[in-house]
């Protein structure tokens, strides 16, 4: 019947050693051995019926024996309950009394055990964990149950095993059996393939900036399997990351800030049982300088009839290595003053009276001038030349 599990697969129970038939030879008349002697080392296999949840004990003998009070058909004792002892009295016409009294120590039901993969997904690329789980209770003494694993040439006598330092993407076969009173009654095999490992490190070929707002990075991909790349670029404390297609070997970075150091990190990753990131390859570059932005909050204030105080705030983006403020003063189209200071604070004295002037303030970063902030202001007539001197407001 299909309901029976083949003993060699899952439910064999046989004491260690093989059956030995003892015979005594007498020259004149051959005498029969006792059945107790003849069947001293009898072995038993247990067959489990998944439908009835009962065992059948198969007696490993060469002839059809009798089983006393227990009926046995074709050397099989039927309807044995798990974890219960049954006594069988074995006799045969080839042997004499006393009969062999065989105690059948029935194991737990096979379905009460399950071989479980306990591998942590994070470590599934280099480790395997297998564990026998008791999924239902039984009354057999658990101290009489032992577990055995064989994985390759390694043998473990544990309920749970952990194999470490394995190769990713490799198949490993583990055979396991459970023994009751040192006799195997179930076994299982598992072939486990370790997960994809972390990809290797990409090899950066070059990484540079040849413009103020752009940079480029090129690389060779790692050897091991991967799904995509992550490219991160960091300026000061700001970090931006991009997901890049696995087929890319070059990426052009756009909209970068001029005269800024960028640190780039590139790693491959694979989405397996979990996402595994490979080691990051690092490089850096500094973008070229560019014109600074306009100074802001420029003010022109009259300090006398023909003197001005010009101030401004630094540009939001300097975009270059140095810091210098320039003030150009024009009357008509003629440049009449051109000053340069470390700070945007200019005292412009001794201008012509009653004259229109244009004041242009801009920032220079050592490489480029910025756009000027322009204000127009006229000087007054010379009030000191008049007899009535007014308060300066």
């Amino acid at each position: 019947s299909d309901a029976y599990l083949n003993a060699s697969e899952t439910t064999t129970l046989s004491p260690s050693g093989s059956a030995v038939i003892s015979t005594t030879t007498i020259a004149t008349t051959p005498s029969k051995p006792t059945c107790d002697e003849k069947y001293a080392n009898i072995t038993v296999d247990y067959l489990y019926n998944k439908e009835t949840k009962l065992f059948t004990a198969k007696l490993n003998v060469n002839e059809n024996v009798e089983c006393g009070n227990n009926t046995c058909t074709n050397n099989e004792v039927h309807n044995l309950t798990e974890c219960k002892n049954a006594s069988v009295s074995i006799s045969h016409n080839s042997c004499t009394a006393p009969d062999k009294t065989l105690i059948l120590d029935v194991p737990p039901g096979v379905e009460k055990f399950q071989l479980h993969d306990c591998t942590q997904v994070e470590k599934a690329d280099t480790t395997i964990c297998l564990k026998w789980k008791n999924i239902e209770t039984f009354t057999c003494d658990t101290q009489n149950i032992t577990y055995r694993f064989q994985c390759g040439n390694m043998i473990f006598d544990n309920k749970e095993i952990k194999l470490e330092n394995l190769e990713p993407e490799h198949e490993y076969k583990c055979d396991s059996e459970i023994l009751y009173n040192n006799h195997k009654f179930t076994n299982a095999s598992k072939i486990i393939k370790t997960d994809f490992g972390s990809p290797g490190e990409p090899q950066i070929i070059f990484c540079r900036s040849e413009a103020a707002h752009q940079g480029v990075i090129t690389w060779n991909p790692p050897q091991r399997s991967f799904h995509n790349f992550t490219l991160c670029y960091i300026k000061e404390t700001e970090k931006d990351c991009l997901n890049l297609d696995k087929n890319l070997i070059k990426y052009d970075l756009q909209n970068l800030k001029p005269y800024t150091k960028y640190v780039l990190s590139l790693h491959a990753y694979i989405i397996a049982k979990v996402q595994r990131n490979g080691s990051a390859a690092m490089c850096h570059f500094t973008t070229k300088s560019a014109p600074p932005s306009q100074v802001w909050n420029m003010t022109v204030s009259m300090t006398s009839d023909n003197s001005m105080h010009v101030k401004c705030r630094p540009p939001r983006d300097r975009n270059g290595p140095h810091e210098r403020y320039h003030l150009e003063v024009e009357a008509g189209n003629t440049l009449v003053r051109n000053e340069s200071h470390k700070n945007c604070d200019f005292r412009v004295k001794d201008l012509q009276y009653s004259t229109d002037y244009t004041f242009k303030a801009y920032f220079h970063n050592g490489d480029y001038p910025g756009e000027p902030f322009i204000l127009h202001h006229s000087t007054s007539y010379n009030s000191k030349a008049h007899h009535h001197h007014h308060h300066h407001h």
Epitope: S301, M302, D305, T379, H391, H392, H393
Partner: nanobody, 126 residues
Amino acid sequence: QVQLQEFGGGLVQAGASLRLSCAASGGTFSYFMGWFRQAPGKEREFVATINRNGGATGYADSVKGRFTISRDNAKNTLYLQMDSVTPEDTAVYYCAAARESSVYYTSTDPAEYGYWGQGTQVTVSS
């Protein structure tokens, strides 16, 4: 305490002219004065400034040659003549008078102004 009140704002076509005035009351009119404006969503910006006797003026580059600031001290009134207006001139225009402690004769810096009007809306349609 000086109070300032602007007049003359309104809706005007691009290319037209408009004259804003600012009446001062409650104090002497012996301060430098100025006009500032603020467009929606933008910061307040300097437009024009004039010293106490009208002898010196200053302008933002965007209005130079189109706008003229003047004052009539006898009437305690400040003016802004706006010619050839464009939609970019649309804003609320504020009149301002210098703070008493200012050491300057004029200034384009709003921090140097201690008195401000409520503002008048100028809208230039294209």
